[in-house]
Amino acid sequence: IWELKKDVYVVELDWYPDAPGEMVVLTCDTPEEDGITWTLDQSSEVLGSGKTLTIQVKEFGDAGQYTCHKGGEVLSHSLLLLHKKEDGIWSTDILKDQKEPKNKTFLRCEAKNYSGRFTCWWLTTISTDLTFSVKSSRGSSDPQGVTCGAATLSAERVRGDNKEYEYSVECQEDSACPAAEESLPIEVMVDAVHKLKYENYTSSFFIRDIIKPDPPKNLQLKPLKNSRQVEVSWEYPDTWSTPHSYFSLTFCVQVQGKSKREKKDRVFTDKTSATVICRKNASISVRAQDRYYSSSWSEWASVPCS
Amino acid sequence: RAVPGGSSPAWTQCQQLSQKLCTLAWSAHPLVGHMDLREEGDEETTNDVPHIQCGDGCDPQGLRDNSQFCLQRIHQGLIFYEKLLGSDIFTGEPSLLPDSPVGQLHASLLGLSQLLQPEGHHWETQQIPSLSPSQPWQRLLLRFKILRSLQAFVAVAARVFAHGAATLSP
């Protein structure tokens, strides 16, 4: 058993049929010695008396808020949560496996630049009695600070018969060094509590590996005289690291016909313009990627040829 | 060419070669990008590699003030990786494919390090840890880790030279 926060404790349980329960001794936080009684949750029934209460925690029915009282006055509370371990593996019932980029990916994170700011998100089908708490650091043995905000519900989607909820959190490295080569990964730890179930999820990454630039901005077409060719121009996204002479991007320009089956013409360039042939009803799209490190491409920025 | 004492390197040549290094490092093992090698337990090799750190002056401001600190750090790293790529980690079993870009990568590392430091001028270099993994699978894992680390190193070096070429060239 360990303390998650003040008056909230996590009991770690082996979750198999013939596992013994965990013996837990609750102590009433009071200088009083006599006349103390214990209750659980909303029930007024007395579960025991005395300054300590020894319980066996085996089921979710044994978890909850234990309260000690004296003469009708509440003295203290202890909320017990359960953390299940099945076949030596901690349960992951609360969050959905996103399976990208690999199985058992519960947290996904992205950064728009090298400033040390990043966003993580996760999915669940649970709509109520759910809380998240996020902590982060750079490195784990001698951790350096990363400050995370509160996790918020960022999207709701209907997937078949189920509703899916996306939560996200923004974090900022306290002393980020955008130009340095990272040697210690960022660690992100999410505590999830659903009713009386506690779970924790972790992700470890380098900012460089989760970079995904915003799409190029101000995408414009300039027809070239007496030609089907057009000059496409664009600019670096506002959110990208500066100076651009140092934090450079490379771009992919694509001409796509109306039908998905039509052949796509693609051009790769380090410049912020390119000359392409504009077909009727086609569209021109441009996306960006770090020039020197193959992290994710941005989403496409598009304009119609006409 | 860089010259002793603190003259500028051939920024544009260094830029071109470092960008080529980036391409080669990723083509040497593109799949490396999708493998989470940190799960495999960090071995001394990848812990001991020279990283370009915050105080090394490789940021735009540091380069403007005095690029020599950063260039020395980059040179150290290039020599370190060049030696690793020439060691039995890469020459031993399992053999690299004949068309593997590792050979080119090795040569380019040497080329860039020579651009930074001509004969007769010596910067302090870092000691290479003696590594001789016994099992072929250990060697394979080590290769992945070294290449993954190299990808990050050459990306920073390429940024330095691109910025230098754009802003510090005479």
Partner: antibody, heavy 119, light 107 residues
């Protein structure tokens, strides 16, 4: 006052189905799991299983798994034990009981339902 | 599953006497053992839980002791209403199991 009131005695033929009930009152129904115990004529007590009234989480005695089904209706604070096809060997007194949280034993018992299966 | 063996199967005693019933587990159940009393035609009633804790409303002449595999229920001075069948139950490991029962009869 805590009370567990069980449905009346049943006489059934082999192969028939049956559902007996146990209505709780006088306490917070969702705080306490409900269990069932069998006592065959002239024999001792046998633990059938327990069930959470919150989310219908169930722990069956392997000996009874597939033989009986436990269920619960939160809205009426009632627990059920049912058989889809009775056998003569199901003849027994069935008790529902309230599981004490933080312990696991039964602190309050229903009066019992006698089930007789005979052709 | 854990087997609980009660002894004796039958105990004859007189009112006012001290009665002791033993319960032995086939493996350790820590202190997670309860004692119940059952009278003819009635449901069982909880007497002792966690090996030695008296259930609310139960007279103080009933007491329990033991831990691990050996447990004892003691009635310090028998009253006429104490003659019944007594069962021990372990609730440490599923499936929870009962002892076979001890009949306490008037001598």
């Amino acid at each position: 006052e805590v009370q567990l009131v069980q449905s009346g005695a049943e006489v059934k033929k082999p192969g028939e189905s049956l559902k007996i009930s146990c209505q709780s009152s006088g306490y917070s129904f969702t705080t306490y799991w409900i269990g069932w115990v069998r006592q065959m004529p002239g024999q001792g007590l046998e633990w059938i299983g327990i069930m959470s009234p919150v989310d219908s989480d169930i722990r069956y005695n392997p000996m009874f798994r597939g033989q009986v089904t436990m269920s619960v209706d939160k809205s009426s604070s009632t627990a059920y034990l049912q058989w889809s096809s009775l056998k003569a060997s199901d003849t027994a007194m069935y008790y529902c009981a309230r599981r004490r949280p933080g312990q696991g034993y039964f602190d309050f018992w229903g009066q019992g339902t006698m089930v007789t299966v005979s052709s | 599953e854990i087997v609980l063996t009660q002894s004796p199967a039958t105990l004859s005693a007189s009112p006012g006497e001290r009665a002791t019933i033993s319960c032995r587990a086939s493996q350790s159940v820590s202190s997670w053992l309860a004692w119940y009393q059952q009278k003819p035609g009635q449901a069982p009633r909880s007497l002792i839980y966690a090996a030695s804790n008296l259930q609310s409303g139960i007279p103080a002449r009933f007491s329990g002791s033991g831990s691990g595999t050996d447990f004892t229920l003691t009635i310090s001075s028998l009253e006429p209403e104490d003659f019944a069948v007594y069962y021990c139950q372990q609730y440490n490991i599923y499936p929870f199991t009962f002892g076979q029962g001890t009949r306490l009869e008037i001598k």
